[in-house]
Interface confidence: low
Amino acid sequence: EEELQVIQPDKSVLVAAGETATLRCTATSLIPVGPIQWFRGAGPGRELIYNQKEGHFPRVTTVSDLTKRNNMDFSIRIGNITPADAGTYYCVKFRKGSPDDVEFKSGAGTELSVRAKPSAPVVSGPAARATPQHTVSFTCESHGFSPRDITLKWFKNGNELSDFQTNVDPVGESVSYSIHSTAKVVLTREDVHSQVICEVAHVTLQGDPLRGTANLSETIRVPPTLEVTQQPVRAENQVNVTCQVRKFYPQRLQLTWLENGNVSRTETASTVTENKDGTYNWMSWLLVNVSAHRDDVKLTCQVEHDGQPAVSKSHDLKVSAHPKEQGSNTAAENTGSNERNIY
């Protein structure tokens, strides 16, 4: 009779994480008598995966009923595969011995590769807001994938970006890998509603890449433009001065009116108007009782936006151009939401 051969027909098996791996093994003969064992790896440090004779292996099931005496199929299934299960598995035939069984012949081995999906990409932007024309960095991270080959792309509103650097770690062999990418994005004034998308394509995703997004609304600061204008006289001794604060983002804004350098009123933007591009407009007005001033008045609209240094715009109010004094107090009123840029 021909000597027993242990046949492992599959050089390699590729399994997605969480699925079940089937490792095939058949013997050409029932002789010599003795059990089959499965190992991961070779040599003295090999790991026992299954022993036909004894032991408890909860993740392993046999394909055939090994108790049948004519059984020559020693294939096994390993459930709930993780990247840590990757390696070369050997089906080894033992010959019954005393006191211990003796290794008789080994199969050629089957390499189990685990395809693990990358985790959902996490995109994070800069810690501090930046203004248009500035370049900001976004990072994208995804972990736990295998095999190592992976493609990462960056998009801004569907348009692919090219200025980025990507690393996959570790460089050597590993059960799973991580990817880290940093993209540079130049902000524009229209980016309040923009999205930066990190797209990860991997063999495990079957053509349906994973995406992580960051809204540039959390990154951008669009500083306001100010315009101070004097409205027609509403009453003989009153002048209405408006400060139009346009195209700013985010909404956090405090406005202070100064009369000749002295604070007249401070208010916080509340009822703002949203522009199509996501920026905001706001208008504040100051009703100045000119009769309370003997000299010309310098009115300043000072705006502190999102904690940044204040910007201001001034308007010189010529007192001499108005009727003679009536009354003595300076009155002030304010309003909100009142302006919209026409694109």
Partner: antibody
């Protein structure tokens, strides 16, 4: 839930004027622009203009200046478009529409059901 | 005004077929919006900011493009996709629409 409810169909004579209404519910009426769009039978869409109800600021397509006039009534959350000196060219379906990305979970763009205007002698 | 030219004006596609239609602007635009309109119904926003799907829009729809050239793609045509599709720009007033692409089932 955001809704734009437009007034019913109108049959008008040439030279007359008509006022179409668009009642808004389900959001902060004064904060968001209402736009008007024209669609003639078998034709595409034409942007007429827009109004911000809170401030009554308007932007008109140059082509419709003198033809369309927008007004708003904040007490009833209603925007109106008046079309004057009607001709057969004004026969169309008129839509009011609203854009507002952050004011609702179930959409970013809302349209009225349309008002059909027929101009015929 | 910025003239948007859609092509083709009329097209037909079989169920399951990939469909692509284009919108060209006479002047560059920042973003493109796409609407779907079925007969006797109001237009419905499909895509805004060139590529972002509006809530409830199936993932088979996608948008791309920049500058003067934009496109709308349906990865696999379904019966309910038969409609007229319009592009619109909001970069410069008046906010013009394209002439539309009528998509029919083959």
């Amino acid at each position: 839930q955001v809704q734009l409810q437009q007034s019913g169909a109108e049959l008008m004579k040439p030279g007359a004027s008509v006022k179409i209404s668009c009642k808004a519910t389900g959001y902060s009426f004064t904060k968001y622009w209402i736009e008007w769009v024209k669609q003639r039978p078998g034709h595409g869409l034409e942007w007429i203009g827009e109004i911000l109800p809170g401030s009554v600021i308007t932007n008109y397509n140059e082509k419709f200046k003198g033809k369309a006039t927008f007004t708003a009534d904040t007490s009833s959350n209603t925007v109106y478009m008046q079309l004057s000196s009607l001709t057969s060219e004004d026969s169309a379906v008129y839509y009011c529409t609203k854009w507002g990305l952050y004011d609702s979970d179930d959409g970013v763009d809302y349209w009225g059901q349309g008002t059909t205007l027929t101009v015929s002698s | 005004e910025n003239v948007l030219t859609q092509s083709p004006a009329i097209m037909s596609a079989s169920l399951g077929e990939k469909v692509t239609m284009s919108c060209r602007a006479s002047s560059g635009v920042n973003y493109m919006y796409w609407y779907q309109q079925k007969s006797d119904a109001s237009p419905k926003l499909l895509i805004y900011y060139t590529s972002i799907l509006a809530p409830g829009v199936p993932a088979r729809f996608s948008g791309s493009g920049s500058g003067n050239s934009y496109s709308l793609t349906i990865s696999s045509m379904e019966g309910e996709d038969a409609a007229t599709y319009y592009c619109q720009q909001f970069t410069s007033s008046p906010y013009t629409f394209g002439g539309g692409t009528k998509l029919e089932i083959k």
